[in-house]
């Protein structure tokens, strides 16, 4: 009686279980009662990453330098090329088809997490006691200067964008 289901790494065709092609190979011809499945390696610029019955391999992704892309991992007959972005850029999507510049954190905000090839800069507002007076993709919020440790007093209060201004103590009040 012909099978209705096949083992792992097999497929059912013409009431017969045929072996799937291994990763890196494509199907040329199905097995018969007398012959095995015929498979052929994918070409140099193609891949198949699963046991399969595909008659065509997939083209490797191209990490186009004109789009700011670079190769993170070369494609093989069994795996696709993995792209990432050049320094200063990050991917616009999970599949990393193109890149955009990292955003900078504006004055009053500091870098919580530096951008990578696949994720943008994460900014956070500078809390009380901290400030950032620059637009930067790298700088964290910095603490206000401690006037006391310098034997000075606060002459102008700090904000989230400016440091405190220290000055000499008013000796006449002492």
């Amino acid at each position: 009686e012909p099978p209705t289901a096949c083992r792992e790494k097999q497929y059912l065709i013409n009431s017969q279980c045929c072996s799937l092609c291994q990763p890196g190979q494509k199907l040329v011809s199905d097995c018969t009662e007398f012959t095995e499945t015929e498979c052929l390696p994918c070409s140099e610029s193609e891949f198949l990453d699963t046991w399969n019955r595909e008659t065509r391999c997939h083209q490797h992704k191209y990490c186009d330098p004109n789009l700011g892309l670079q190769v993170q991992q070369k494609g093989t007959s069994e795996t696709d090329t993995i792209c990432t972005c050049e320094e200063g850029l990050h991917c616009t999507s999970e599949s990393c088809e193109s890149c955009v510049p990292h955003r900078s954190c504006l004055p009053g905000f500091g870098v919580k997490q530096i951008a990578t090839g696949v994720s943008d800069t994460i900014c956070e507002p500078c809390p009380v006691g901290f400030f950032s007076n620059v637009s930067s993709a790298f700088e964290k919020c910095r603490p206000w200067t401690s006037c006391e440790t310098k034997d000075l007093v606060v002459q102008q209060a700090g904000t989230n964008k400016t440091d405190v201004v220290c000055g000499p103590q008013d000796r006449q009040r002492a």
Epitope: P23, G24, S43, E44, S45, E46, D49, Q59, H60, Y62, Q70, V71, Q72, Q73, K74, T76, S77, E78, T79, D80
Partner: antibody, heavy 116, light 113 residues
């Protein structure tokens, strides 16, 4: 017999141009990725460019990007490297190498000397 | 760029001796998709182009004598010649075949005592 033979090397002045070729025989040229690799006493072995089979995807080393162009003519079983704005540090033996995931066949090389 | 560091830079040996040379990469050459290490070894004799010996870190190219063995994974790799012959005197290079730019080590020169 699988063979790669480079030609077109020579002496060129700084800022000049040169086109080197690689003639392939004994295998289906269009099925393989092709590369240029150079070798000098100063820098050792240095991969400089790759062109894939199929769609002809291209990658370059930063040291030659914008100055060198890799191309292929599958009908003539030939690989090319057009070199412009040549510098003294481009002086080297230039090899073409076939690849299907790794460099399995290399040519005998052609010497490029950049000097005034 | 991946930096390939080979050691020692030269080795003086006697015929029949067992030789090991090291190659370290600045980042892993292991492809997580197929669990292969994309590290290649070449042999170069004076006046000749490099010749493929080992690919995928441990797979011997056809026609290469079985006295040549590649091993290692991730960032640390070794080429072993079980019993050096006079014809093995050459420079041995390892190469990152994992990502572009493809990079080579500076080589290990094998010399006869």
């Amino acid at each position: 017999e699988v063979q790669l033979v480079e030609s077109g090397g020579g002496l060129v002045k700084p800022g000049g141009s040169l086109k080197v070729s690689c003639a392939a025989s004994g295998f289906t040229f269009s099925d393989y990725g092709m590369n240029w690799v150079r070798q000098s006493p100063e820098k050792g072995l240095e991969w400089i460019a790759y062109i894939s089979s199929g769609r002809g995807n291209i990658y370059y080393a930063d040291t030659v990007k914008g100055r060198f162009t890799i191309s292929r003519d599958n009908a003539k079983n030939t690989l090319f490297l057009q070199m412009t704005s040549l510098r003294s540090e481009d002086t080297a033996m230039y090899y073409c190498a076939r690849s299907w995931g790794y460099f399995d066949v290399w040519g005998t090389g052609t010497t490029v000397t950049v000097s005034s | 760029d991946i930096v390939m560091t080979q050691s020692p830079s030269s080795l003086t040996v006697t015929a029949g001796e067992k030789v090991t040379m090291s190659c370290k990469s600045s980042q892993s050459l292991l492809n997580s998709g197929n669990q292969k290490n994309y590290l290649t070894w070449f042999q170069q004799k004076p006046g000749q182009p490099p010749k493929l010996l080992i690919y995928w870190a441990s797979t011997r190219e056809s026609g290469v004598p079985d006295r040549f063995t590649g091993s290692g994974s991730g960032t640390d790799f070794t080429l072993t010649i079980s019993s050096v012959q006079a014809e093995d005197l050459a420079v041995y290079y390892c190469q990152n075949d994992y990502t572009y730019p493809l990079t080579f080590g500076a080589g290990t020169k094998l010399e006869l005592k």
